[in-house]
Every structure is written in structure tokens, then in C-alpha cells.
């Protein structure tokens, strides 16, 4: 089947790194220059991701692969293949419509990324605050009131910090 | 083709005024968000202002009240006029197309201008 379909298509030879030329008697072109072909058989070349402004260049072009881009530093990527750049903030700060923003009280950020989120509420787990929240860190709950008492004969180990978990990009 | 140039940089003394100007061609500008960014000498990328095609303009707080973005659609131009000059605003100063219309975030196929300097000293 492979033969049979190369004679019939000629341009089934042409290997990643060159296009079909319909202009040139299907003859196998090599892609020109800022254009590549990742797959044999290509009838056209594709242009070259070109990374600029905020995005840098991660891996060149070649004929046979495009370009990669990441982000300048102080920025980040966002979406499939960094399609994106963000701009970082602080820790305790988050990106809004007027640039980066320290966090609201009660709320804390421990990223460069991402929003500012709640602290966590420990009497909802029947805890107490062993170490107050700031911007850049949630609290640290500890033992509950009761366990905190006069007489109590041992105290409770804090529970560690929840991990907080990662804003939806 | 599609272009972007940036022109009105210069040295001016801190408190003293520049007027940047981004000419554009080769896109529909008329409906096209825009932005400026700078970069300081060996510091980041930083986003200072962007505009909607509607007008409607937002800023980095540390030049609020200091620069003013604005476009004008017949000339395919947008500009930045920035007053009460500090030597912190010494940067390359970038006009560029914005179409995530989030602040501090451009997309892959955003156009880039090649920047012009603003150095302000006395």
C-alpha cells in the first residue's frame, strides 16, 4: 500500500523539512528560511512562531520544528504552550485591572501568580489561630480552645499549614 | 505588513514632560486595544498603561495621575503623555498591541514596536 501510494503521490517522499512544489514539478523544496515542516508530505511550509516583546525565544526554529517561546523574566507563562505572559507580582500582592495589588486584609498570596485568597478559618475545624495570617501567608491553626485550658496535661502539636492550592490559570 | 514605531523618546530633566507616539499600519487599528510597557536597564518588563479601542484607559499605579494614554483612530496612533518625570521612569518604552484585554497579560500574536528610550536625569 505505502508503494502503491507513493507513485501515486509523489509528494508522500517529501520529508519533514521540505514541501510538495506544486510549482516545480512536485519536486521535494527544502522550507525557506523562517518556515519549517514538522511532517513529511506537506504540501506547504509553516511560518516560524516568532517570540517578542514579553515572550523570549526558548528553542529556535528549524526547518523541520517551530520555534518555542517562554517569558521575559518578571512575567510568566499562561495557556498551552505559553500562548501567554503575565506579569508577576510580589508575594501578598495580586495582578489586577490597575497592575499589581497588595492583598485585602484577611486574604493572603504566597505566589508571584494567582489571586489572593481567604485565610483559613479555624474554628470551622473547632482550632484556634496559633500563628495570624499576613499577606503572604495563610494562619497556622492550632490546638483547639478546649485542649488550650488550665489543667489540660498535654497540648495538642499544631496542625501544619494547609498547602494552598493553585488558582485556575 | 504590520508595524509599530515608536517615536518621542529622549533625555529630559526629572519633572520635565515627553509625549511618546505609536504609529501604526498594516492591522485595523480603529478596533484594536492598545499598551505600553517598559523596560529599565537591567531591570523587568513592566505593563504601564493600555487603552480599549473604546477609549476607556488604565494604568500601572506608579504613573497614574502622571502619564495619560490616549489613540487617535484617524492618525492609527496612540500616544503617551508623561508629566512629573522621575528617573525611575528611565526605561525603553514599548507600544504594543493588546488583545487579551487583561491587564498585565499579552497574547502570542501581539504586535511588538522596537521601543524608544526615555532617560530622565539631571
Known amino acids: 500500500f505505502e508503494r502503491t501510494r507513493s507513485l501515486q503521490d509523489p509528494c508522500s517522499n517529501c520529508p519533514a523539512g521540505t514541501f510538495c512544489d506544486n510549482n516545480r514539478n512536485q519536486i521535494c523544496s527544502p522550507c525557506p528560511p523562517n518556515s519549517f515542516s514538522s511532517a513529511g508530505g506537506q504540501r506547504t511550509c509553516d511560518i516560524c512562531r516568532q517570540c517578542k516583546g514579553v515572550f523570549r525565544t526558548r528553542k529556535e526554529c528549524s526547518s523541520t520544528s517551530n520555534a518555542e517561546c517562554d517569558c521575559t523574566p518578571g512575567f510568566h507563562c499562561l495557556g498551552a504552550g505559553c500562548s501567554m505572559c503575565e506579569q508577576d507580582c510580589k508575594q501578598g500582592q495580586e495582578l489586577t485591572k490597575k497592575g499589581c495589588k497588595d492583598c485585602c486584609f484577611g486574604t493572603f498570596n504566597d505566589q508571584k501568580r494567582g489571586i489572593c485568597r481567604p485565610w483559613t478559618n479555624c474554628s470551622l475545624d473547632g482550632k484556634s489561630v496559633l500563628v495570624n495570617g499576613t499577606k503572604e501567608r495563610d494562619v497556622v491553626c492550632g490546638p483547639s480552645p478546649a485542649d488550650l485550658s488550665p489543667g489540660a496535661s498535654s497540648v495538642t502539636p499544631p496542625a501544619p499549614a494547609r498547602e494552598p492550592g493553585h488558582s485556575p490559570q | 505588513e504590520v508595524q509599530l514605531v515608536e517615536s518621542g523618546g529622549g533625555l529630559v530633566q526629572p519633572g520635565g514632560s515627553l509625549r511618546l507616539s505609536c504609529a501604526v499600519s498594516?492591522?485595523?487599528?480603529?478596533?484594536?486595544?492598545m499598551s505600553w510597557a517598559r523596560q529599565a536597564p537591567g531591570k523587568e518588563f513592566e505593563w504601564v498603561s493600555s487603552?480599549?479601542?473604546?477609549?476607556?484607559?488604565y494604568y500601572v499605579e506608579s504613573v497614574k495621575g502622571r502619564f495619560t494614554i490616549s489613540r487617535d483612530n484617524a492618525k492609527n496612533s496612540v500616544y503617551l503623555q508623561m508629566s512629573s518625570l522621575r528617573p525611575e521612569d528611565t526605561a525603553v518604552y514599548y507600544c504594543?498591541?493588546?488583545?487579551?484585554?487583561?491587564?498585565?497579560?499579552?497574547?502570542?500574536?501581539?504586535?511588538w514596536g522596537q521601543g524608544t528610550l526615555v532617560t530622565v536625569s539631571s
Open positions: 504594543a498591541t493588546w488583545k487579551t484585554l487583561r491587564v498585565g497579560v499579552w497574547d502570542e500574536s501581539d504586535y
Open positions: 498594516g492591522f485595523t487599528f480603529s478596533s484594536s486595544a
Open positions: 487603552i480599549y479601542s473604546s477609549g476607556k484607559t
